[in-house]
């Protein structure tokens, strides 16, 4: 994960280590779950599109008394534009399927790390 | 209804600066991240820049960049764009947008037209 | 920075024609990519995004489809008030730069 940071473009707030400390956030709940995460919570999953931040912000908020992915919670805010709630979804919100938030947060981090791959971050 | 009705457009010289203003009404403004849009005349759509819901972030074209801030007084349901340092190659109108989850462009303004000439 | 090329430029069509748009990216952009309708005189207005996804008031004869590099806009059967330039767009995962194709005009033979 050390070397992602030059894939981020410098600047604006956030900075360029951004998106590696989110990334790397989501590998320290991965790697460090024990019990289940959330105590097995379950959240809508979501498209992974160009604006997955929004729609993974307004999946997780609605987790509460989670510890493990308060700093997540905080992360993914800013990366979305727009004020997320909780009960909020927006229009293009795809509520068909619950899975728990650790299959969630594993496949954020696969897609994630996808694009990296891709060179798909400026 | 969303409205979004952009002013402060008209013609310039270069190196005037200038700022444009969209007021919004139909929704909840301080809710949203905001863009501007630009088109020349006859010409494609560009974007210009977005600021977050709480004006927390900003991001600009790189043909911007320097030259223009995005910013928004959510008391007011206003968005700004200040123009310094204008070129003949800033002519164009200018599009207020709305963003909404997946969808960054969902409701446009009408545009106001600046014209950078001597 | 992915650029996107549309083709073709201008598309000469009559009323009840099928009309296929083309719009490649320099490189992948998954799904994520969104069709605009513009008319002269008139803002952009939304017609599909995610590439296959019809937006609110998106008649049914608009259709997307493709992923990757290669996205097609579909109008099955050519209305009057279809003729327009119609702009593919796409967005980056991180910053958010947002970036228009060139367009492509539909106008009547």
């Known amino acids: 994960l050390t070397c992602l940071g030059g894939f981020a473009s410098p600047g604006p707030v956030p900075p360029s280590t951004a998106l590696r400390e989110l990334i790397e956030e989501l590998v320290n709940i991965t790697q460090n779950q024990k019990a289940p995460l959330c105590n097995g919570s379950m959240v809508w999953s979501i498209n992974l599109t160009a604006g997955m931040y929004c729609a993974a912000l307004e999946s997780l908020i609605n987790v509460s008394g989670c510890s493990a992915i308060e700093k997540t919670q905080r992360m993914l805010s800013g990366f979305c534009p727009h004020k997320v709630s909780a009960g909020q979804f927006s229009s293009l919100h795809v509520r068909d399927t619950k899975i728990e938030v650790a299959q969630f947060v594993k496949d954020l981090l696969l897609h994630l790390k996808k694009l990296f791959r891709e060179g798909q971050f400026n | 209804e969303v409205q979004l009705v952009e002013s402060g457009g008209g013609v310039v010289q270069p190196g005037r600066s200038l700022r444009l203003s969209c007021a919004a009404s139909g929704f909840t403004f301080s809710n949203y991240g905001m863009h501007w849009v630009r088109q020349a005349p006859g010409k494609g759509l560009e974007w210009v820049a977005i600021?977050?819901?709480?004006?927390?972030?900003?991001y600009y074209a790189d043909s911007v960049k320097g030259r223009f801030t995005i910013s928004r007084d959510n008391s007011k349901n206003t968005l700004y764009l200040q123009m310094n340092s204008l070129r003949a190659e800033d002519t164009a109108v200018y599009y207020c947008?709305?963003?909404?989850?997946?969808?960054?462009?969902?409701?446009w303004g009408q545009g106001t037209l600046v014209t950078v000439s001597s | 920075e992915i650029v996107l090329t549309q083709s073709p430029a201008t598309l000469s069509s009559s009323p009840g024609e099928r009309a296929t748009l083309s719009c490649r990216a320099s490189?992948?952009?998954?799904?994520?990519l969104a069709w605009y309708q513009q008319k002269p005189g008139q803002a952009p207005r939304l017609l599909i995004y995610?590439?296959?996804n019809r937006a609110t008031g998106t008649p049914a004869r608009f259709s997307g489809s493709g992923s990757g590099t290669d996205f097609t806009l579909t109008i099955s059967s050519l209305e009057p008030e279809d003729f327009a330039v119609y702009y593919c767009?796409?967005?980056?995962?991180?910053?958010?730069?947002?970036?228009f194709g060139p367009g492509t005009k539909v106008d009547i033979k």
């Open positions: 995610d590439a296959s």
């Open positions: 767009h796409q967005r980056s995962h991180w910053p958010p730069i947002f970036t």
């Open positions: 600021i977050w819901y709480d004006g927390s972030n900003k």
């Open positions: 947008v709305k963003g909404s989850g997946d969808i960054p462009f969902d409701y």
């Open positions: 490189q992948s952009v998954s799904s994520y």
